[in-house]
């Protein structure tokens, strides 16, 4: 059975939306098959407002009878998608998603794109080929991601709060050095949480807290000078880079694409 | 186990024609597109065309168009090539090949008919 | 047509040598995430022997010091270390659309 190792190239297209797609690692695959390919399933993370395009297995059109896109997402019915050679004709079953369609003509790609990538592509994708002696398939569990919006403000003294806005999945925030802390988590009907981290400094010694925000699209790191005033409520949005506001300045070092590297601290 | 076993070798004169047999065992004949493939001496090998005996579908490298002609015959698990209007640059050793479905590759291969042409 | 050029056509090399064969293509071979690019090995009168398919992928039964890499135009076959019963033709090959060979590249002992 294939070694489930993952490429995922991306590039810029005209349209400035990212595009990705996502096939099979050629490095990995250590394919000892008989008459019929192991079901193989990867699951796939990809930003929301990019496109996407899911493969087949490489086989020949000239081995295939069907090729068949099985498309379950939540709360509807599967839509299938289904080319057969023979008649050169392409069918669709319960599918109302006009952004989800066959790259080019069936007959001359198989593969299936998405664009863009909205939160209800959340789901399983599965490309179905149908030869004379078996079937091949390919599976993908879609995890859609949105970037999360971070804020990071002082409330009180010796008090800030860290806020990772409408994240998919959760994002993670930590702080350097630890403090007293205490997160909530607040879910959304579209999937999306926010997640809420506030911490206070006892020690007085402490002058400039950073809050890290690790997310599958990327980290987000910000800092902000405690204020010894009672009251003062400062706040700056993240996103842009070495913002500045008229009581102190915000250092934001955005990394993109660093999901594989986070770092979890559970805080209290 | 699947083996591919070529008719022997033959000598032909110029403008005759020659039919090289494939018989097919230990898989369903019908199941995988059959190759053909040369080699003449020193060279490069050369791609003929392909059958599909599934659906008698078949396609050849337009050198050949024309002169080659792909068949089959399902109920004896055998595809044949046969060469017209043959010369003497057509001496080379043909092999019947079977596409496995991933990846397009040949793992199983005929053991080769060489076709000589002389006068 | 796609044309596959390999490089170098013949080479000398002894018994625990590495040995480098490279193919370029006229165009990529590379679609939907594979590359169709496969390697044989050839011994007089005997038929090719399949020893990497997809570019990168070890066919069952064939030695580790075998590898494949690249994509798109340009591709590699490694033997690590060469054996004895490593002296043969080596050829490129791809298999989309249309099928086509590289020329050969004939692995002599030094």
């Known amino acids: 059975q294939p070694n489930n190792s993952l490429m995922l190239q991306t590039s810029k297209e005209n349209h400035a939306l990212a595009s990705s797609s996502l096939c099979m690692d050629e490095k990995q695959i250590t394919q000892n098959y008989s008459k019929v390919l192991a079901e193989v399933n990867t699951s796939w993370p990809v930003k929301m407002a990019t496109n996407a395009v899911l493969c087949c297995p490489p086989i020949a059109l000239r081995n295939l009878i069907i090729i068949t896109w099985e498309i379950i997402l939540r709360g509807q019915p599967s839509c299938t998608k289904a080319y057969r050679k023979e008649t050169n004709e392409t069918k669709e079953t319960n599918c109302t998603d006009e952004r989800i369609t066959w790259v080019s003509r069936p007959d001359q790609n198989s593969d299936l794109q998405i664009r863009p990538v909205a939160i209800t592509h959340d789901g399983y994708y599965r490309c179905i080929m149908v030869t004379p002696d078996g079937n091949f398939h390919r599976g993908y569990h879609l995890q859609v991601l949105v970037t999360p919006e971070v804020t990071l403000f002082q409330n009180r003294n010796r008090t800030a709060v860290c806020k990772a806005v409408a994240g998919k999945p959760a994002a993670q925030i930590s702080w350097i050095p630890e403090g007293d802390c205490a997160t909530k988590q607040e879910y959304w009907s579209n999937g999306t949480v926010t997640v809420k981290s506030t911490c206070h400094w006892e020690v007085h010694n402490v002058s400039t807290v950073t809050c890290h925000v690790s997310h599958l699209t990327g980290n987000k790191s910000l800092y902000i000078e405690l204020l010894p005033v009672p009251g003062a409520k400062k706040s700056a949005k993240g996103g842009g880079s070495g913002l500045n506001d008229i009581f102190e300045a915000q250092k934001i070092e955005w990394h993109e694409g660093s999901g594989g590297h986070h770092h979890h601290h559970h805080h209290h | 186990e699947v083996q591919l076993v070529q008719s022997g070798a033959e000598v032909k004169k110029p403008g005759a024609s020659v039919k090289v047999s494939c018989k097919a065992s230990?898989?369903?004949?019908?199941?995988?597109?059959m190759f053909w493939v040369r080699q003449a001496p020193g060279q490069r090998l050369e791609w003929i065309g392909y059958?599909?005996?599934?659906?008698?579908?078949?396609k050849y490298n337009e050198k050949f168009k024309g002169r080659a002609t792909l068949t089959s015959d399902k109920s004896a698990s055998t595809a044949y090539m046969e060469l017209s209007s043959l010369r003497s640059e057509d001496t080379a050793v043909y092999y019947c090949?079977?596409?496995?479905?991933?990846?397009?590759?040949?793992?199983?291969w005929g053991q080769g008919t060489l076709v000589t042409v002389s006068s | 047509d796609i044309q596959l050029t390999q490089s170098p056509s013949s080479l000398s090399a002894s018994v625990g040598d590495r040995v480098t064969i490279t193919c370029r293509a006229s165009?990529?071979?590379?679609?939907?995430?594979?590359?169709?690019m496969h390697w044989y090995q050839q011994k007089p009168g005997k038929p090719p022997k399949l020893l990497i398919y997809l570019a990168s992928n070890l066919e069952s039964g064939v030695p580790s010091r075998f590898s494949g890499s690249g994509s798109g135009t340009d591709f590699t076959l490694t033997i690590s270390s060469l054996q004895p019963e490593d002296f043969a033709t080596y050829y490129c090959?791809?298999?989309?659309?249309?099928?086509?060979f590289g020329g050969g590249t004939k692995v002599e002992i030094k």
């Open positions: 090959q791809h298999n989309r659309e249309l099928l086509t």
């Open positions: 059958i599909n005996p599934y659906n008698d579908d078949t």
């Open positions: 165009k990529s071979v590379s679609t939907s995430g594979y590359s169709y």
């Open positions: 090949a079977r596409e496995d479905y991933y990846g397009s590759r040949f793992v199983y």
């Open positions: 230990g898989y369903t004949f019908t199941s995988y597109v």
